[in-house]
């Protein structure tokens, strides 16, 4: 058993049929010595008396808010949560496996630039009695500070018969050094509590590996005289690191119709303009990627050909 | 050429060669991003590699003030990786695929380090740690880690030279 926060404790249980469970001793936070009784949750049934209560925690029915009283007055609470371990593996029931970029990916994180600011998000089908708390650091043995905000519900989607909820959190490295080569990864830890179930999820990454620039901005077209060709120009996204002579992007320019199966014109360039062939009912799209490190491409920025 | 005395390097040549290094480093191990190598206890194996750190003057302001600190750091790293790529970690079993770009990568690291430091000038270089994995699978894992680390190192070096070519070239 360990303390998650004040008056909230996590009991780690090996979860299998007829498991013996864990013996837990609760102590009432009071100077009083006698006349103390214990109850669980809303029940008035007295579980025991005395300053300490010893319980065998085997299942969720044994978890909950234990309260010690004296003469009708509440003295203190202890909330017990369960953390299940099945076949040596901690349970991951609360969050959905996003399976990208690999199986058992519960947390996904992205950064728009090298400033040390990043966003992580996760998915669940649970809608109520759910809380998250996020901590982060650079490195684990001698951790350097990363400050994370509160996790918030950022999207709701319908997936078949189920509703899916997306939560996200923004974090900022306290002393970021955008130009340096990272040697220690960022660690992100998410504590998830659903009713009386506790789970924790972690992710470890370098900012450089989670970079995904915003799409290029201000796409403009200029038809070339006596030609099917069009000059398309754009600008670096506002959110990208500066100066651009140092933090350079490379671009992919594509002309395609509505369907992915349609024929296309495609060209890669390090410049902020390119000449392509425009077709009726097609769109010109441009996306960006770090020029020197193969992290994710941005989403496409598009303008119609006509 | 960047000599220890403080003259300017051939920024544009360095830019071209460092960009080539980036391409080669990714083609040497393109799928490395799909392996979570940190799960394999990174600390003891690749913590010894030289990293371009915050105080090394490789940021735009540091380059403007005095690019020599940064260039020396890059030079150290290039020599370090060049030696690693020529060591038994890469030459031993399992043999590299014949079409592996590691050979080209090795030559390009040497080429860029020579551009930065002509013969007759000597910046101190970092000792190569004795990384001699006994098992072929350990060697394979170490190669992945070294290449992964090299990708990050050459990305910073390429940014430095691109910025230098754009803003510091005579």
């Amino acid at each position: 058993i360990w303390e998650l926060k004040k008056d909230v404790y996590v009991v780690e249980l090996d979860w299998y049929p007829d498991a013996p469970g864990e013996m837990v001793v609760l102590t009432c936070d009071t100077p009083e010595e006698d006349g103390i009784t214990w109850t669980l949750d809303q029940s008035s049934e007295v579980l025991g008396s005395g300053k300490t209560l010893t319980i065998q925690v085997k299942e969720f029915g044994d978890a909950g808010q234990y309260t010690c009283h004296k003469g009708g007055e509440v003295l203190s609470h202890s909330l017990l949560l369960l953390h299940k371990k099945e076949d040596g593996i901690w349970s991951t029931d609360i969050l959905k496996d996003q399976k990208e970029p690999k199986n058992k990916t519960f947390l996904r994180c992205e950064a728009k630039n090298y400033s040390g600011r990043f966003t992580c998000w996760w998915l669940t089908t649970i809608s109520t009695d759910l809380t998250f708390s996020v901590k982060s650091s650079r490195g684990s043995s001698d951790p350097q500070g990363v400050t994370c905000g509160a996790a918030t519900l950022s999207a709701e989607r319908v997936r078949g018969d189920n509703k899916e909820y997306e939560y996200s959190v923004e974090c900022q490295e306290d002393s970021a050094c955008p130009a340096a080569e990272e040697s220690l990864p960022i660690e992100v830890m998410v504590d998830a509590v659903h009713k009386l179930k506790y789970e924790n999820y972690t992710s470890s990454f370098f900012i450089r590996d989670i970079i995904k620039p915003d799409p290029p901005k201000n796409l403009q077209l200029k038809p070339l005289k006596n030609s099917r060709q069009v000059e398309v120009s754009w600008e670096y996204p506002d959110t990208w690191s500066t100066p651009h002579s140092y933090f350079s992007l490379t671009f992919c320019v594509q002309v395609q119709g509505k369907s992915k199966r349609e024929k296309k014109d495609r060209v890669f360039t390090d410049k902020t303009s390119a000449t392509v062939i425009c077709r009726k009912n097609a769109s010109i799209s441009v996306r960006a990627q770090d020029r020197y490190y193969s992290s994710s491409w941005s989403e496409w920025a598009s303008v119609p050909c006509s | 050429r960047a000599v220890p005395g403080g003259s300017s390097p051939a920024w544009t040549q360095c830019q071209q060669l460092s960009q080539k290094l980036c391409t080669l480093a990714w083609s040497a191990h393109p799928l490395v991003g799909h392996m979570d190598l940190r799960e394999e206890g990174d600390e003891e194996t690749t913590n010894d590699v030289p990293h371009i750190q915050c105080g090394d003057g490789c940021d735009p302001q540091g380059l403007r003030d005095n690019s020599q600190f940064c260039l020396q750091r890059i030079h150290q790293g290039l020599i370090f990786y060049e030696k690693l790529l020529g060591s038994d970690i890469f030459t031993g079993e399992p043999s590299l695929l014949p079409d592996s770009p590691v050979g080209q990568l090795h030559a390009s690291l040497l080429g860029l380090s020579q551009l930065l430091q002509p013969e007759g000038h000597h910046w101190e270089t970092q000792q190569i740690p004795s990384l001699s994995p006994s098992q072929p699978w350990q060697r394979l894992l170490l190669r992945f880690k070294i290449l992964r680390s090299l990708q990050a190192f050459v990305a910073v070096a390429a940014r430095v030279f691109a910025h230098g070519a754009a803003t510091l070239s005579p």
Epitope: E262, D265, V267, T269, D270 | -
Partner: antibody, heavy 118, light 107 residues
Framework: QVQLVQSGAEVKKPGASVKVSCKAS????????LHWVRQAPGRGLEWMGW????????EHAPKFQGRVTMTTDTSTSTAYMELRSLRSDDTAVYYC???????????WGQGTMVTVSS | EIVMTQSPATLSVSPGERATLSCRAS??????LHWYQQKPGQAPRLLIY???QSTSGIPARFSGSGSGTEFTLTISSLQSEDFAVYYC?????????FGGGTKVEIK
Amino acid sequence: QVQLVQSGAEVKKPGASVKVSCKASGYTFTDYYLHWVRQAPGRGLEWMGWIDPENGDTEHAPKFQGRVTMTTDTSTSTAYMELRSLRSDDTAVYYCNANKELRYFDVWGQGTMVTVSS
Amino acid sequence: EIVMTQSPATLSVSPGERATLSCRASQSISINLHWYQQKPGQAPRLLIYFASQSTSGIPARFSGSGSGTEFTLTISSLQSEDFAVYYCQQSNSFPLTFGGGTKVEIK
């Protein structure tokens, strides 16, 4: 599978014109760009231009501007390349090729030898 | 127009050996570079597109790398059917242009 079959060899006199055909099969004709590339004997490859069978748009290499016409007949899934004012240095194998991507050449015809000789 | 230069013009290699073919562009073309193989009396065949992407059905011994102005086609272990002429082609801008070719012959 995608296939391009070209017309047979031609012998022409200088100053004459030649029209080479290229019949496509195995795909929807308007879904691919069609290019023409030629290769003089013992020499390298030279791009001549492309046509979009969907709308008849064309783009030619400046070298052939005014001397080449590329057309398509969607009813027969056939592309044509006509080269006028032939000279001896137009002697070459002429290839048509098709791709969904505009700028490189995935599927090639077998080639048509055009000999220009007096 | 962009001029593509291939080297060497002829490469003599023994079967089983590695062949490295070079292609240089007269200006930076990013990764807009494609490789073709042509055997005598046949049409060319696409091997690699956008510098390093392998065409389906092409043996894994063919690989491409490079960006900017310098590109390489590597054949890791030459088989008898690989002796042919290899062309690079840029697609950075029109007119599309080819290199002069490298003939890979049996040593």
